[in-house]
């Protein structure tokens, strides 16, 4: 089938990094500066990617794949192939339309990105709070309250050891 | 109707120095992304330099960088290409041509002409 294809369209047989040149009875030429062909037959090459102002190139364009832009210090990629800059905030903060905001009391955010989440509630697992929360870090949960009344031991005593080679019976 | 007309090769020593000209007629050089490609003996076009509106730069290819150097007189309607430091691998046809944009969003050049040869030979 390819034979058969690359008899009747000389195009198929142009790699990546050129066009196929219609002009020129179908030679494969060479992609223009600042352009690409990802893949081989194709009749024009696509512009490359240009990283510019919040943007920064993380990789060039070549004339077979195109650029790949990431952000500048201070801002993180959305979106895919990073279609999108957001502003970093610090932790214990999150993103609104007005800028970097602290969190509320009984939220926290741990990263420079996304929003503050409530802290868990330990009361929900039957559990109590051993260390508070901050805007920055959420809740420790430690053992319920019925693991810690008198004569109740949190630790689990140890497996009886066998004796090697003797089976349990 | 567009042309473009390669003038200034020549033979020239190792070493030695050239001045291309390409001058344009029917349509507007300073308007467009405009260049020079060059197809040595047996072997593939390969694009040499450039000047690129919508890049907002000037390209050269690793080989020339350095050595090469593209510009335009828009009064004259005419782009250069100044070569200098020759080497016997700068043989080739050297074709100016202008980069194509089209509607879909695609990319190609077209170029006119029968080119000029420049050959670097002692």
């Known amino acids: 089938f390819e034979r058969t294809r690359s008899l009747q369209d000389p195009c198929s047989n142009c790699p990546a990094g050129t066009f196929c040149d219609n002009n020129r009875n179908q030679i494969c030429s060479p992609c223009p500066p600042n352009s690409f062909s990802s893949a081989g037959g194709q009749r024009t090459c696509d512009i490359c990617r240009q990283c510019k102002g919040v943007f920064r190139t993380r990789k060039e364009c070549s004339s077979t794949s195109n650029a790949e832009c990431d952000c500048t210090p201070g801002f993180h990629c959305l979106g895919a192939g990073c279609s999108m800059c957001e502003q970093d905030c610090k932790q214990g903060q999150e993103l609104t339309k007005k800028g970097c905001k602290d969190c509320c009391f009984g939220t926290f955010n741990d990263q420079k990105r996304g929003i503050c989440r409530p802290w868990t509630n330990c009361s929900l697992d039957g559990k109590s709070v051993l260390v508070n929360g901050t805007k920055e870090r959420d809740v420790v949960c430690g053992p319920s309250p019925a693991d810690l009344s008198p004569g109740a031991s949190s630790v689990t005593p140890p497996a009886p050891a066998r004796e090697p080679g003797h089976s349990p019976q | 109707e567009v042309q473009l007309l390669e003038s200034g090769g020549g033979l020239v020593q190792p070493g030695g120095s050239l001045r291309l000209s390409c001058a344009a007629s029917?349509?507007?050089?300073?308007?467009?992304?405009v260049g020079w490609v060059r197809q040595a003996p047996g072997k593939g076009l390969e694009w040499v330099s450039a000047i690129l509106d919508f890049g907002g730069s000037t390209y050269y290819a690793e080989s020339v960088k350095g050595r090469f150097t593209i510009s335009r007189d828009n009064a004259k309607n005419t782009l250069y290409l100044q070569m200098s430091s020759l080497r016997a691998e700068d043989t080739a046809v050297y074709y100016c041509?202008?980069?194509?944009?089209?509607?879909?969003?695609?990319?190609?050049?077209?170029?006119w002409g029968q080119g000029t040869l420049v050959t670097v030979s002692s």
């Open positions: 041509a202008r980069v194509v944009y089209h509607a879909g969003g695609g990319v190609t050049f077209d170029y």
């Open positions: 029917g349509f507007t050089l300073s308007a467009e992304d």
